[in-house]
Amino acid sequence: MMTGTIETTGNISAEKGGSIILQCHLSSTTAQVTQVNWEQQDQLLAICNADLGWHISPSFKDRVAPGPGLGLTLQSLTVNDTGEYFCIYHTYPDGTYTGRIFLEVLESSVAEHGARFQIP
């Protein structure tokens, strides 16, 4: 029986050109975490394996950094990075737990000025 729950940072926003940490945490289970896969929609971003360590997909190597912990750091954000991210915890003996994070990348100037200056 799967008793664990995944806590995530939920819906987050960040500025274009900046960086963001994606974090998930598995709790309420004694299951052993063997691997955590990070996905963006239908793309595998990175894998952290208990034995092998980190593998970052080559196409994301320039902008994705492992950690902190089992989390993932996205750098040099673009508007195209907006979307859903998933942390997939492979555990034994429970099986697989999945957490979801929604990231919105904002144009920094638009975000700032849009909030402060309302056109009547």
């Epitope: 063997t34 691997q35 595998l44 394996n49 034995d51 092998l52 196409s59 034994y92």
Partner: antibody, heavy 118, light 107 residues
Framework: EVQLLESGGGLVQPGGSLRLSCAAS????????MSWVRQAPGKGLEWVAG????????GYADSVKGRFTISRDNSKNTLYLQMNSLRAEDTAVYYC???????????WGQGTLVTVSS | DIQMTQSPSSLSASVGDRVTITCRAS??????LNWYQQKPGKAPKLLIY???SLQSGVPSRFSGSGSGTDFTLTISSLQPEDFATYYC?????????FGGGTKVEIK
């Protein structure tokens, strides 16, 4: 250099048993998921079974479930496939394979031929 | 189980040709799709993993694309040593499953 060397294949009668072994070297065997993949003569590839690094997690193809058992001895750097109740359709070359992150197969053995015939 | 359908099952091409092989999964497999090359009497060789990542040592004329259910292996300029059989394989869930293979022959 990564090496996977299968042994134990041969001719066996229907209903018989065989145990295949795969001796691994050149990498930290205990850290990797390992699998057996087979190929019948003139046919495509079929995944047979897989075992995660700590032996806790195992998986089998429906066609061999209940008849084949995958196991490993990390102290001996060896992967095994115990095959019971063999059938003619199990005739194939059996490959031992390394599966990093349980996602892709980056190294294969040279294969060992199992022939099930009376 | 997830079914993998490859097309075409065989094709004839000339050296220098651009060759495209497609693979379709019976359900979404994200980018958990790998491509292998096999020559007669030899073990398969990994070309592309996770849909688009080129395995170390594999020539850059090989490329992979796609996500979800539809994937493509492209050989930009076919070389004599590329005549072989190519297989796709999903690792989204067990049992792992392979496509039926595409045999690339000399025209």
């Amino acid at each position: 250099e990564v090496q996977l060397l299968e042994s134990g294949g041969g001719l066996v009668q229907p209903g018989g048993s065989l145990r295949l072994s795969c001796a691994a070297s050149g990498f930290t065997f205990s850290s990797y998921t390992m699998s057996w993949v087979r190929q019948a003569p003139g046919k495509g590839l079929e995944w047979v079974a897989g075992i995660w690094s700590d032996s806790g997690n195992k998986g089998y193809a429906d066609s061999v479930k209940g008849r084949f058992t995958i196991s490993r001895d990390n102290s001996k750097n060896t992967l095994y496939l115990q095959m019971n109740s063999l059938r003619a359709e199990d005739t194939a070359v059996y490959y031992c394979a390394r599966v990093p992150y349980s996602v892709w197969i980056d190294y294969w053995g040279q294969g060992t031929l199992v022939t099930v015939s009376s | 189980d997830i079914q993998m359908t490859q097309s075409p099952s065989s094709l004839s091409a000339s050296v220098g040709d651009r060759v495209t092989i497609t693979c379709r999964a019976s359900q979404s497999i994200s980018s958990y799709l790998n491509w292998y090359q096999q020559k007669p009497g030899k073990a398969p060789k990994l070309l592309i993993y996770a849909a688009s990542s080129l395995q170390s040592g594999v020539p850059s004329r090989f490329s992979g694309s796609g996500s979800g259910t539809d994937f493509t292996l492209t050989i930009s300029s076919l070389q004599p040593e590329d005549f072989a059989t190519y297989y796709c394989q999903q690792s989204y869930s067990t049992p792992l499953t392979f496509g039926g293979g595409t045999k690339v022959e000399i025209k």
